[in-house]
């Protein structure tokens, strides 16, 4: 799915109102020094692509995130604010139903959610190129990071 045409501000609002709090709840009890973020994103559509992948695709050692509250709210936000997103997710939903029913919080899942928090931070505040073409909302899918 191409996230370019999503309403980024509405997704950001949804994240800040509920999803972020659910992620914090999931991570409660974890030391803030425990995980280093290794997944990054360069603009908002890219961030959403990575967020979708980490949230809904089962990985080795963490198969159950899709059933968590933050995942369900993420899916709802994308379905509402990304045109045509729901239609692309029918096959993914079938795969999700086949996944493990029980919710198991493993260390790998905690690490993955820590990565998600980092991706959401960059979605909320992309580190864009210099001013002049640095509108978060409109231009961030057209620019890459400035490497000093």
């Amino acid at each position: 799915y191409d996230f370019t045409n999503c309403d980024f501000e509405k997704i950001k609002a949804a994240y800040l109102s509920t999803i972020s709090k659910d992620l914090i709840t999931y991570m409660s009890g974890t030391k803030s020094t425990e995980f280093n973020n290794t997944v990054s994103c360069s603009n908002r559509p890219h961030c959403l692509t990575e967020i979708q992948s980490l949230t809904f695709n089962p990985t080795a050692g963490c198969a159950s995130l899709a059933k968590e509250m933050f995942a369900m709210k993420t899916k709802a936000a994308l379905a509402i604010w990304c045109p045509g997103y729901s239609e692309t997710q029918i096959n993914a939903t079938q795969a999700m139903k086949k996944a493990r029913k029980s919710k198991v919080t493993t260390n790998k899942c905690l690490e993955q959610v820590s990565q998600l928090q980092g991706l959401w931070r960059r979605f909320n505040r992309p580190l864009l190129k210099q001013q002049g073409s640095s509108d978060y909302k409109d231009d961030d899918d057209k620019h890459h990071h400035h490497h000093h």
Epitope: E9, A13, Y15, L16, S20, I24, S32, T33, E34, F35, N36, N37, S40, S114, Q117, G118, W120, R121, R122, F123, N124, R125, L127, L128, Q130, Q131, S134, D135, Y136, K137, H145, H146, H147, H148
Partner: antibody, heavy 119, light 107 residues
Framework: EVQLVQSGAEVKKPGSSVKVSCKAS????????IEWVRQAPGQGLEWIGV????????NYNENFKGRATLTADKSTSTAYMELSSLRSEDTAVYYC????????????WGQGTTVTVSS | SIVMTQTPLSLSVTPGQPASISCKAS??????VTWYLQKPGQSPQLLIY???NHYTGVPDRFSGSGSGTDFTLKISRVEAEDVGVYYC?????????FGQGTKLEIK
């Protein structure tokens, strides 16, 4: 506990450079942006720029472009702000700050470093 | 750059009374506004993020509202510990910019 500890006060001559350090502890340094803000005596807050310690990406306020250089050393969890071609108007308290968990605010601030530029 | 204009620049309030600070952006900043308090001799501290969200430990007497270009910070009942300079900040576009500050004093 998250802490940002900055280097001590500096007195500099006009035309010289200053390098302020900001040592972070209590969190994964690479995961959060570090912002730099200054405050001239009796004045408000002015944003200098931001660095992503994870990959070195930066964004600068145009007012400081070419004079300010932000760097980060992951091995020591320390961020640096170097300001060159100093003038008297650069006399200020310089703060480093960390972005919050949502990426929408600065939740932890250093204690500030006073830089005085005087001949 | 987006200019953030705060009013009033200073206010003197009796303890227990309300206070209100306005912040106007020169162009729309959506909901990307943060409020900080700088107490005398201290570094700024985060109060409210994304217009109306309380930062951890910030008392409920503080509240934020607004969207687009007009934003307000309200203190329902001012206490002695609330003295200092309040700043709004926009993070909608680079460069990030702050309001000029509003100094709150106790009568």
């Amino acid at each position: 506990e998250v802490q940002l500890v900055q280097s001590g006060a500096e007195v500099k001559k006009p035309g010289s450079s200053v390098k302020v350090s900001c040592k972070a502890s209590g969190y994964a340094f690479s995961n959060y942006l570090i912002e730099w803000v200054r405050q001239a005596p009796g004045q408000g807050l002015e944003w200098i720029g931001v660095i992503d310690p994870g990959n070195g990406d930066t964004n600068y306020n145009e007012n400081f472009k070419g004079r300010a250089t932000l760097t980060a050393d992951k091995s020591t969890s320390t961020a640096y702000m170097e300001l060159s071609s100093l003038r008297s108007e650069d006399t200020a308290v310089y703060y480093c700050a960390r972005e919050d968990n949502t990426g929408t605010a600065f939740d932890y601030w250093g204690q500030g470093t006073t830089v005085t530029v005087s001949s | 750059s987006i200019v953030m204009t705060q009013t009033p620049l200073s206010l003197s309030v009796t303890p227990g009374q309300p206070a209100s600070i306005s912040c106007k952006a020169s162009q729309s900043v959506s909901s990307d506004v943060t409020w900080y308090l700088q107490k005398p001799g201290q570094s700024p501290q985060l109060l409210i993020y994304y217009v109306s969200n309380h930062y951890t430990g910030v008392p409920d007497r503080f509240s934020g509202s607004g969207s687009g270009t007009d934003f307000t910070l309200k203190i329902s009942r001012v206490e002695a510990e609330d003295v200092g300079v309040y700043y709004c900040q926009q993070h909608h576009r680079f460069p990030l910019t702050f309001g000029q500050g509003t100094k709150l004093e106790i009568k």
